[in-house]
């Protein structure tokens, strides 16, 4: 806390400019009018204030706006944003995407800080849903943003926003998140033709059910092994050798390299060795010839 001291004669700030960098902390406190600071916030960024001086400027704004800063000030905070605490940010009402972009720019290249997380949370809650423009902006700054949301939060993403999602935005998503995103993507891309549809839906397939994988296997999509390995094990298990062969196309030979990884390993264990042998890949571990396969899950469902 800076002590209240009178401003020395002739030092009263008429505007926010470079001369202020020579002011001591107490002089800044005494000689800079908070209302002037608020109206000229856009100038602060261009002036090489020390961290201590920025603390004083923040203190002045806090005094002027104890209930939270108005958006006109927030938009021009620049590096002063890095001084804000999540508690400060919770008082704000940020509605403009331009304001959000301006503040994300300040933190660009860094991990998502608690301040940024709070800002995004306030912004999205204020909008009511994660619309396409917001998602575009957030994933541009933080490719992993989408995967940081809970399945519940993801449920508020409208299908139209899915168009903004790039494959790298889904890299860190877990199966629960893809379970929520996949049906939205399916809806978003439903009017595309076969090959274009596959290119768009491919990144979301970790949430696809067996029926959809069977349907894809009829469309000559040539799924690569990296995508296949991300599929839900329970969705892959019911696929036949012929269906997997059609689904993977020329990539089918890649099964050998992944035969000990899930879901390939579990799928192999469910296939007849005879059927696996037709692939000519040397896959081992299938059900030996002559063995009867009982589907106990079906039996349980009936009883």
């Amino acid at each position: 806390e800076v002590e209240k001291t009178a401003c020395p004669s002739g030092k009263k700030a008429r505007e926010i400019d470079e001369s202020l960098i020579f002011y001591k902390k107490w002089e800044l406190e005494a000689c800079v009018d908070a209302a002037l600071l608020a109206t000229q916030m856009d100038r602060v960024n261009a002036i090489p204030f020390t961290y201590e001086q920025l603390d004083v400027l923040k203190h002045k704004l806090d005094e002027l706006y104890p209930q939270g800063y108005p958006e006109s000030v927030i938009q021009h905070l620049g590096y002063l944003f890095l001084k804000m605490s999540p508690e400060d940010i919770r008082k704000w009402n940020v509605t403009s995407l331009e304001t959000l972009k301006a503040l994300l720019e300040v933190n660009k290249g860094h991990e998502m800080s608690p301040q940024v997380a709070t800002l995004i949370d306030r912004f999205v809650k204020g909008r009511g849903q994660l619309d396409k423009d917001t998602l575009d902006t957030l994933t541009a700054f933080y490719p992993g943003y989408l995967c940081s949301l809970s399945p519940e939060e993801l449920s508020s993403v409208p299908p139209s926003s899915i168009w903004a999602v790039r494959p790298q935005d889904l890299d860190t998503c877990d199966p629960r998140q893809l379970d929520v995103l996949y049906p939205k993507a399916r809806l978003a891309f439903q009017n595309m033709n076969g090959s274009e549809y596959f290119v768009k839906i491919q990144s979301f397939l970790g949430g696809a059910p067996t029926e959809d994988l069977k349907a894809l296997s009829q469309q000559n999509v040539s799924m690569d092994l990296a995508t296949f390995m991300k599929l839900r094990t329970d969705a892959v298990l019911p696929l036949t050798v012929a269906e997997v062969q059609k689904l993977l196309g020329p990539h089918v030979e890649g099964l050998k390299a992944e035969e000990r990884h899930r879901p390939v390993r579990d799928w192999i264990l469910r296939q007849r060795q005879d059927d696996l042998d037709t692939l000519g890949l040397g896959l081992q571990g299938g059900i030996p010839n002559g063995y009867l396969v009982l589907d106990l899950s079906m039996q349980e469902a009936l009883s």
Epitope: D171, M229, R260
Partner: antibody
Framework: EVQLVQSGAEVKKPGASVKVSCKAS????????MDWVRQAPGQGLEWMGD????????IYNQKFQGRVTMTEDKSTSTVYMELSSLRSEDTAVYYC????????????WGQGTTVTVSS | EIVLTQSPDFQSVTPKEKVTITCSAS???????LSWYQQKPDQSPKLLIY???NLASGVPSRFSGSGSGTDFTLTINSLEAEDAATYYC?????????FGGGTKVEIK
């Protein structure tokens, strides 16, 4: 440019553990498995196991089962290989090597990390 | 596990000479699942040939690979000074993946 950058040399006492890191850059991290291969002084290459960075699934060579743990951190595109209960025979250069998912050959290798186990 | 035996262990060759390295497997290896690596002193291994005969990116055409079943061959058609290295065959046809013991090629 595709690069695998490994952590620096380590000297450990018998019975201790060592954790070697391998940071990937210049490609889509989740499209490639990361394998670990070691080479004892003046010896050949020995495959230790692999990790699928997308799923976190691991496969270990039976010889190292129970002593080796491979993990990944997608947020930093880094994989780790930890070897426990070290003995003098574990003195070697440890390499991480990239392997495209669906293939079995290693197209890019890290620079290697020398681990010396000595009392 | 499949044991890969390379021969010879060591070869001293004059430049422009042809070099042949063999890799013999203790049981059959599907040819798509065999590769060769080159390792120069104090360097990491480098992929040379994959799927028995496919040249990796940037590898000179004087290198070639062939073979099937249990017998595979790496050939350097006209040896150059920069080819001084140890060469390893590697199989991923059967678990665990294994490497040959290596063949050291020295320039005379």
């Amino acid at each position: 440019e595709v690069q695998l950058v490994q952590s620096g040399a380590e000297v450990k006492k018998p019975g201790a553990s060592v954790k070697v890191s391998c940071k990937a850059s210049g490609y889509t991290f989740t499209d490639y498995n990361m394998d670990w291969v070691r080479q004892a002084p003046g010896q050949g290459l020995e495959w230790m196991g692999d990790i699928n960075p997308s799923t976190g699934g691991t496969i270990y060579n039976q010889k190292f089962q129970g002593r080796v743990t491979m993990t990944e951190d997608k947020s930093t595109s880094t994989v780790y290989m930890e070897l426990s209960s070290l003995r003098s025979e574990d003195t070697a250069v440890y390499y991480c090597a990239r392997r495209r998912i669906g293939t079995g050959y290693f197209d890019v290798w890290g620079q290697g990390t020398t681990v010396t186990v000595s009392s | 596990e499949i044991v890969l035996t390379q021969s010879p262990d060591f070869q001293s060759v004059t430049p422009k000479e042809k070099v042949t390295i063999t890799c013999s497997a203790s049981s059959s290896v599907i040819s798509s699942y065999l590769s060769w690596y080159q390792q120069k002193p104090d360097q990491s291994p480098k992929l040379l040939i994959y799927r028995t005969s496919n040249l990796a990116s940037g590898v000179p055409s004087r290198f070639s690979g062939s073979g099937s079943g249990t017998d595979f061959t790496l050939t350097i058609n006209s040896l150059e000074a920069e080819d001084a290295a140890t060469y390893y065959c590697h199989q991923w046809s059967s678990f665990p993946y294994t490497f040959g013991g290596g063949t050291k090629v020295e320039i005379k």
